[in-house]
């Protein structure tokens, strides 16, 4: 009986977690448009978790659509995204793993994990739901996959999806990867501004790291990410004080986000503007 | 082994209310997204609402929004579901399901309870 | 609101091919899930994202969508396929989740 059959798994916590989308148009389905030009194309497959080529009619679609694998992978997975660096080289831990536990000022009640450097572990706290600091993961396993000593210092950062062998369940398959980049400050003040997907058009605003401002953009109404403020103030007073590191093979560099000449900040700039 | 189980169901009064709960087991709750999904007697599957892991969405079915809502409590691995303002109409099988693969809502429901039946009767 | 319309019925001869439809307006641009749920039961995902196979659910079962119809086929139907079978998509416009109305697979 299939019913019996969908008992005999268990997952495990070591599990990792399920996919979090850097931009909710990368969860669209390839779209072909009504037009007939073979062109080819790159998408984000949610399934997979990876950019996949596909043929373009050149006419319509939609905006998971790009013209390179590299930009595929640059705007939709996660390890270019607001995550940590490492080059094959590197295997110190990012900075945020050193940050004590914080609840942040908000009174929300909710189960977090923070790497404790006293016991080189990760370990649960109770998260208000606001504000904060890096070391803040929703999972157990991210944690331990980011600032935990692994094996080789490589952070599991890429994921592929499969379904689990006796259940059915989708369970990510990991595969470890190197990331480049590492963020401090609210990490929802890194992510790029995201419409969502309705078809409003309210006024808002979002953090801007790659110049350090808050500027306005139009929101859908619905979907999106967390760095959206219905005011200016508001956006400033939750995310003005974060700023950028890098870490390159001649050390750290901090860099206050004001200036605008970093490489690390022409990088993102792209994706801020391209998302817009 | 992957379970989750549905309660709280039963006979209840046009008008009144019903709190269903969905105890989750042997995967992270925390890390997933949750529906709940009806059936009426004799008919087809009817999305009621879903919740993201750490319940900062929310998103209901017209049929539903203003009467029901639900939530979640990490720390104990459970889903509900606040039913106010019943109707005869919302007599069905009421299921939980677990999203897999992603927090997205083009990711499928691949966990599901069994169900509890809830009436709405007079 | 896109809508999903499947057959009330569709049936097979034992060892035959089963194609159940489930059609909407420019369906082959969204995701479409497929569940199999027998009577007294929860449902179970048999087809996800179109045409991918859960492990677990056997080769026969296979899916596809394109235009306007998304399609749910089982070769060499067996007698426990004898169920109800729902597609299932995700209208990104009002963040709602759609299912058909369903189709009843009778093995004759």
């Known amino acids: 009986d299939s019913e019996e059959d969908e008992e005999h798994t268990i997952i495990t916590d070591t599990e990792l977690p399920p996919l979090k989308l850097m931009h909710s148009f990368c969860a669209f389905k390839a779209d072909d448009g009504p037009c007939k030009a073979i062109m080819k194309r790159f998408f984000f497959n949610i399934f997979t978790r990876q950019c996949e080529e596909f043929i373009y009619g050149g006419c319509e679609g939609n905006q998971n659509r790009f013209e390179s694998l590299e930009e595929c992978k640059k705007m939709c997975t996660r390890d270019n995204a607001n995550r940590i660096i490492k080059t094959t080289l590197q295997q110190e831990k990012p900075d945020f793993c050193f940050l004590e536990e914080d609840p942040g000022i908000c009174r929300g009640y909710i189960t977090r994990y923070f790497y404790n450097n006293q016991t080189k572990q990760c370990e649960r706290f109770k998260y208000g739901g606001c504000l904060g600091n890096m070391n803040n993961f929703e999972t157990l396993e991210e944690c331990k996959n980011i600032c935990e000593d692994g094996p080789n210092g490589f952070q599991v950062d890429n994921y592929g999806t499969q379904l689990n062998a006796v259940n059915n369940s989708l369970t990510p398959q990991s595969t470890k990867v190197p990331s480049l980049f590492e963020f401090h400050g609210p990490s929802w003040c890194l992510t790029p501004a995201d419409r969502g997907l309705c078809r409003a058009n309210e006024n808002r605003f979002y953090y801007n790291s790659v110049i350090g401002k808050c500027r306005p953009f139009k929101y859908s109404g619905c979907g999106g990410n967390e760095n959206n403020f219905t005011s200016k103030q508001e956006c400033l007073r939750a995310c003005k004080k974060g700023f950028i590191q890098r870490i390159s093979k001649g050390g750290l560099i901090k860099t206050k986000r004001k200036r605008k000449k970093q490489r690390v900040k022409i990088a993102y700039e792209e994706i801020f503007v391209k998302n817009m | 082994q992957v379970q989750l189980v549905e309660s709280g169901g039963g006979l209840v009064q046009p008008g009144g209310s019903l709190r269903l709960s969905c105890a989750a087991s042997?995967?992270?709750?925390?890390?997933?997204?949750m529906s709940w999904v009806r059936q009426a007697p004799g008919k087809g599957l009817e999305w009621v609402s879903n919740i993201s892991s750490n319940s900062s969405n929310t998103y209901y079915a017209d049929s539903v929004k203003g009467r029901f809502t639900i939530s979640r409590d990490n720390s104990k691995n459970t889903l509900y579901l606040q039913m106010n303002s019943l109707r005869a109409e919302d007599t069905a099988v009421y299921y939980c399901?677990?999203?897999?693969?992603?927090?997205?809502?083009?990711?499928?429901?691949?966990?599901w309870g069994q169900g509890t039946l809830v009436t709405v009767s007079s | 609101d896109i809508e999903l319309t499947q057959p009330p019925s569709v049936s097979v001869a034992p060892g035959q091919t089963a194609r159940i439809s489930c059609s909407g307006d420019?369906?082959?641009?969204?995701?479409v899930h497929w569940y199999q749920q027998k009577p007294g039961q929860a449902p179970v995902l048999v087809i996800y994202g179109d045409n991918n196979r859960p492990s677990g659910i056997p080769e026969r079962f296979s899916g596809s969508n394109s235009g306007n119809t998304a399609t749910l086929t089982i070769s060499g139907t067996q007698a426990e396929d004898e169920a109800d079978y729902y597609c299932q998509t995700y209208d990104s416009n009002n963040e709602s989740i759609v299912f058909g109305g369903g189709t009843k697979l009778t093995v004759l």
């Open positions: 420019n369906l082959g641009t969204y995701y």
């Open positions: 042997g995967f992270t709750f925390n890390s997933y997204a």
């Open positions: 399901a677990r999203k897999g693969g992603g927090e997205h809502g083009f990711f499928p429901s691949d966990i």
